[in-house]
């Protein structure tokens, strides 16, 4: 019952004499394991005996019996793993026919037939080509052989026109229940030159011997393959000559359909044949020619033919790299004169006069100068003649103003406060001068272009420079104005002593000034408006208070004189010329007020006074005025004072005070004798007690 069995294997196995066959086979039976397997050659069923008869090539029973003489047949499967693969090695032509696989299980029986085709000689492989081959389009060439056997090694090799193909082929072998084959695949980009060539696939044995082969002729579709020919042979022609160009189609598959011609990439109208003739060529017909031929694959373009029409140089023109050009810059001159062949010699002209030593198409002036300005023209020459000289090109050379100088217009010498006029001059300029600049910049008047008026010129306006300017400024050398001025910065400086001045000191004063022009100066010293000396230094060997006062120094030159700020010279000295004065006179009546004042001359002023009697006894009093109120006859006597400042002390001479009796006292005395006691026992005129009680500040 076929529904119980499922057996898979190739339908037909191919081989040749002496080779081998490998029959891949798998089975499945519903009731499980296979018990018996018999391989028949061309089995036939005997109806009478209800069994198959024929040559038994292999028999697998429970005891594993194999018919004698059939060692070349191997059952590679087994009855457990559903594998029924078998091989016959070697195989012979008479093995052709049917192989019968008799399979018996516990309950089921089956006969499976496999066709075996063994040829006398190795059969050829089959080359398979794609339906269309087109140049440069990659395809895969396939060589297929319906044979493969593990025991018999073979090789497939590709040849093109009998020579092995360089491309690497990939060989695939299949030994499956579906198919048995050996296949070689080759990736190949056919070129137009392969058209009509023979490709061979050779079958080789293990020793490299050719067993069989298959051949195909390549039909490679390609665009037309062209070459272009020119008659006469030269592509260099002279103006007026005739030229014929022929487009040769060396190969085309399929045949070409259209022809056209192009010059410099542009289609030439009404030129549709393989031959192009140009009659009496002109300069404009110089160019690159090619033919374009098309077929169904596409258009093809020939190589370009460069047709050169020779002619004498055309009227020239000069190209200048920059105009106007700046002086000192680099300028390139180029002679443009179309000619074929290119001119071999050039003649240059500057303002119509030939420039010597310049015979090139281009020349350069590295540092252009004003005299290089003018009209430049040129002539070009080639083998066909000398070209016409064109009108020329103008070169304008621009430069900053030249030889800029400055002139002082007013008479010299210049004095501080004068009005000075300066002019700025130059020799030449391109473009014209349009403004002027001045250094230093000041709030100065420019009454006209290039003229500067400095009013009330300063003492320190030492140098002025001007620039004449167009696109650039050119500076003149600065002009020293040499402004004359009276001495400046006149000051009194005390050299000695550096501290305060004391009477008797040596004193040095210096008259300083910061600048003077002219430099020759004279000095004058003044004290309280009176002239003291004419040296830069004023010296006092021993200064006295009488030298104090307001000092200033003057410095003069031929322009004028300048005074310093006044300085008050102060002389410090100890109190001097002390004297005691009495406002009421030196004779005072008793009972009145006696005021003694200590007059002094001191710098700084006296800060402390002392009073003494004729015995040089210090009186306990330190005021400037000694006041005796009421005064007594006993106060009569001589007094002196002493003054002190921070410099020192000074004292007065003695002054005598006489205190006389009042009329009342005299009257009482006449009435009453004066006793000895009245005079008192002391020699001191004024007692401590008296002073204490009677002196009032």
């Amino acid at each position: 019952d076929s529904s119980k069995w499922n057996i898979e294997h190739p339908g037909t196995i191919y081989a040749w004499e002496g080779a081998c066959v490998w029959v891949p086979c798998t089975y499945r039976v519903l009731d499980g394991a296979l018990e018996t397997f018999i391989l028949f050659h061309n089995p036939e069923y005997n109806q009478n005996m209800s069994k198959f008869e024929g040559t038994r090539l292999y028999e697998s029973t429970k005891d594993g019996k194999v018919p004698s003489g059939q060692k070349r047949v191997q059952f590679l499967g087994n009855k457990i793993n559903n594998n029924c693969t078998l091989s016959i090695h070697p195989v012979h032509v008479n093995d052709s026919g049917q192989l019968g696989l008799r399979m018996v299980s516990k309950t089921e029986k089956w006969m499976e037939r496999i066709h075996l085709n063994v040829s006398e000689r190795p059969f050829p492989p089959r080359i398979q080509l794609p339906p269309k081959l087109q140049e440069s389009q990659e395809v895969t060439l396939t060589c297929l052989l319906n044979f493969s056997c593990y025991g018999y090694q073979i090789q497939l090799q590709w040849l093109l026109e009998g020579a092995p193909m360089r491309q690497a082929a990939v060989t695939l072998t299949s030994l499956s229940t579906k198919s048995v084959f050996t296949r070689s695949e080759l990736k190949f980009s056919p070129q137009w030159s392969h058209h009509g060539k023979i490709v061979t696939c050779e079958l080789h044995d293990v020793d490299g011997k050719v067993l069989s082969e298959d051949m195909v002729q390549l039909n490679v579709k390609h665009t037309p393959k062209l070459t272009i020919e020119v008659t006469p042979n030269e592509t260099i022609v002279r103006k007026g000559d005739s030229v014929t160009m022929t487009c040769k189609v060396n190969s085309s598959n399929p045949e070409y359909t259209t022809v056209s011609w192009l010059k410099d990439g542009i289609l030439l109208k009404e030129q549709n044949t393989l031959m192009l003739t140009l009659h009496k060529v002109t300069k404009s017909q110089s160019g690159r020619y090619c033919c374009r031929v098309s077929n169904d694959v596409g258009p093809a373009t020939s190589e370009k033919v460069f047709l050169q029409v020779q002619y004498a140089p055309e009227p020239s023109r000069v190209q200048i790299s920059q105009s106007p050009a700046v002086e000192g810059s680099e300028v390139n001159f180029l002679c443009i004169s179309p000619a074929n062949p290119l001119p071999t010699n050039y003649t240059w002209y500057h303002n119509g006069k030939e420039v010597q030593g310049r015979t090139e198409k281009q020349f350069q002036i590295q540092k252009i100068l004003p005299w290089h300005a003018g009209t430049y023209s040129c002539e070009a020459e080639n083998i066909l003649g000398i070209g016409e000289r064109g009108p020329g090109t103008e070169l304008d050379v621009q430069y900053p103003p030249k030889k800029v100088t400055m002139v002082i217009e007013n008479p010299t010498p210049i004095r501080e406060g004068d009005t000075v006029t300066l002019s700025c001059n130059y020799s030449s300029s391109n473009p014209i001068v349009n403004h002027y600049e001045w250094r230093p910049r000041g709030a100065w008047e420019e009454p006209s272009l290039g003229v500067l008026k400095i009013q009330n010129i300063g003492w320190n306006n030492t140098a002025v420079a001007c620039a004449a300017c167009n696109n650039w400024c050119s500076w003149a050398s600065p002009v020293t104005l040499n402004v004359l001025y009276a001495p400046r910065g006149v000051r009194v400086r005390k050299i000695k002593p550096l501290s305060e001045i004391h009477s008797g000191n040596s004193v040095s004063l210096q008259c300083d000034f910061s600048s003077s022009h002219p430099k020759e100066v004279q000095f004058f010293w003044e004290k309280n408006g009176s002239l003291l000396g004419k040296e830069s230094q004023l010296n006092f060997d021993s200064i006295s208070p009488e030298d104090a006062g307001s000092y200033s120094c003057w410095v003069n030159n031929s322009i004028g004189q300048t005074a310093s700020k006044a300085w008050t010279l102060e002389v410090l000295y100890a109190p001097r010329r002390l004297r005691v004065s009495m406002s009421q006179g030196n004779q005072v009546m008793e009972g009145k007020t006696a005021t003694l004042t200590c007059e002094s001359d001191a710098n700084p002023p006296v800060y402390s006074y002392a009073w003494f009697d004729w015995n040089n006894q210090s009186l306990p009093y330190s005021g400037r005025m000694l006041r005796l109120e009421p005064v007594k006859v006993q106060h009569s006597g001589a007094y002196w004072c002493q003054g002190t400042n921070r410099v020192g002390k000074g004292h007065s001479p003695l002054i005598t005070l006489t205190v006389y009796y009042s009329p009342q006292t005299i009257g009482r005395r006449e009435q009453k004798l004066i006793s000895e006691e009245d005079l008192g026992g002391e020699q001191k005129l004024i007692s401590e007690e008296d002073l204490h009680h009677h002196h009032h500040h």
Partner: antibody, heavy 125, light 108 residues
């Protein structure tokens, strides 16, 4: 331009003697006092003394009296500061400066201007 | 001798700020005989002010001095990057002439 140019740096050993100089230019050297000022490393300024090149009158700061000698030679516009026996504590920068000034009103001002760039004296055993 | 005391010892400020430096004398400085100097690292001092308030030649007007007697001030109205330095006051009214110990003005 008024300028004071001082002599170069000195490296000395304790006990050695040294004389550094200060040269004036651009003014009448004889008529201006020259001051010497000490600046010890990382410290402030100390006036050492002053000299009047015109007659070489010198005034010392009491702290420096007897430690140094200040002198001048007006013929070559030079002022000098010298030590007879250096000590490590004399390591300092020494500046000379011109004593400028002017009088007006009742005042007489003085100042140090300009200054020399200084002379570095290093005393080390 | 007159001792001059400067304060503060160090002043940390930013450019553009106002700097006020003080100099106090141990006794009255006669006739405002006081000068101010600037010293930058590795350089000699430079005179800024004399007579307590008179600017020396070439000194920018952002520097000003004031004071009399025993209290004096140097003011920098708007600090420029080049003003960061040490500043010394000095009296020349009494012998020996003396300097303050200095005030360092540094960038904050």
């Amino acid at each position: 331009e008024v300028q004071l140019v001082q002599s170069g740096a000195e490296v000395k050993k304790p006990g050695e003697s040294l004389k550094i100089s200060c040269k004036g230019s651009g003014y009448n050297f004889a008529t201006y006092w020259i001051a010497w000022v000490r600046q010890m490393p990382g410290k402030g300024l100390e006036l050492m003394g002053i000299i009047y090149p015109g007659d070489s009158e010198t005034t010392y700061n009491p702290s420096f009296q007897g430690q140094v000698t200040i002198s001048a030679d007006k013929s070559i516009s030079n002022a000098y500061l010298q030590w007879s026996s250096l000590k490590a504590s004399d390591t300092a920068m020494y500046y000379c400066a011109r004593v400028g000034g002017y009088c007006s009103g009742t005042s007489c001002h003085n100042w140090f201007d300009p200054w020399g760039l200084g002379t570095l004296v290093t005393v080390s055993s | 001798e007159i001792v001059l005391t400067q304060s503060p010892g160090t002043l940390s400020l930013s450019p553009g700020e106002r700097a006020t430096l003080s100099c106090r004398a141990s006794q009255s400085v006669s006739s405002s005989y006081l000068a101010w100097y600037q010293q930058k690292p590795g350089q000699a001092p430079r005179l800024l002010i004399y007579g307590a308030s008179s600017r020396a030649t070439g000194i920018p007007d952002r520097f000003s001095g004031s004071g009399s007697g025993t209290d004096f001030t140097l003011t920098i109205s708007r600090l420029e990057p080049e003003d960061f330095a040490v500043y010394y006051c000095q009296q020349y009214g009494s012998s020996p002439w003396t300097f303050g110990q200095g005030t360092k003005v540094e960038i904050k």
